[in-house]
């Protein structure tokens, strides 16, 4: 665990990026599935 003020904000940024990456992967997968089903 970090007490650092630089690391604190960077950790939040990393989490946001991870969520965006995950959502992009999930949505991308769904889109590909829809195209395939058509």
């Amino acid at each position: 665990h970090s007490d650092g003020i630089f690391t604190d904000s960077y950790s939040r940024y990393r989490k946001q990026m991870a969520v965006k990456k995950y959502l992009a992967a999930v949505l991308g997968k769904r889109y590909k599935q829809r195209v395939k089903n058509k």
Epitope: I5, T7, S9
Partner: antibody, heavy 113, light 110 residues
Framework: VEESGGRLVTPGTPLTLTCTVS????????MIWVRQAPGKGLEWIGI?????DTYYASWAKGRFTISKTSTTVYLKIASPTTEDTATYFC????????????WGQGTLVTVSS | DVVMTQTPASVSEPVGGTVTIKCQAS??????LLWYQQKPGQPPKLLIY???TLASGVSSRFKGSGSGTEFTLTISDLECADAATYYC????????????FGGGTEVVVK
Amino acid sequence: VEESGGRLVTPGTPLTLTCTVSGFSLSSYAMIWVRQAPGKGLEWIGIIYDNGDTYYASWAKGRFTISKTSTTVYLKIASPTTEDTATYFCAREPGSTTQNDLWGQGTLVTVSS
Amino acid sequence: DVVMTQTPASVSEPVGGTVTIKCQASENIYNSLLWYQQKPGQPPKLLIYRASTLASGVSSRFKGSGSGTEFTLTISDLECADAATYYCQNYYNIWTNGAAFGGGTEVVVK
């Protein structure tokens, strides 16, 4: 926090500065490198985060490389010029509850032919 | 990178007086600002973080204020020991904005 490795080098000779830390973990804190030319102000060079990610000032990209091991942070100056003559400081980021940071005394790099 | 502009470059005030140092960011950095004091031959010492929070062991004569792009460091009841150079530093989204220092303000105590 203690810097070492500063010395007189000729232009173009690569140089690596060392920052040795104790009393805290580099896996919990970010470290920054800052330099100060004689009689001039502070200049931020770059940062290495707890996870090893590095970011640099625009002017420092390609000229400097920051890396680390478990107890040591490094600053490599790829091809020093006379403008790189300065005291180089290594510092731990401020803590939000400890309310302090940690700076070394600096190490002097002189680039001259 | 965000550019930090500090004014004045130098200021001289008598013991017991008040000094005001301004720091301007080239874009919004919210409250992500540090203030340092540096004396000759020494590394910087952290005075204030988050623009207005006093660091551990720092005298309450030092006061930081501001947010966004305009920040101020006020030193009241000046003492001889306050003679030093003061710097502001941005730390908002370092990964995109960098963490530049202001140019510094030399405080001379008469």
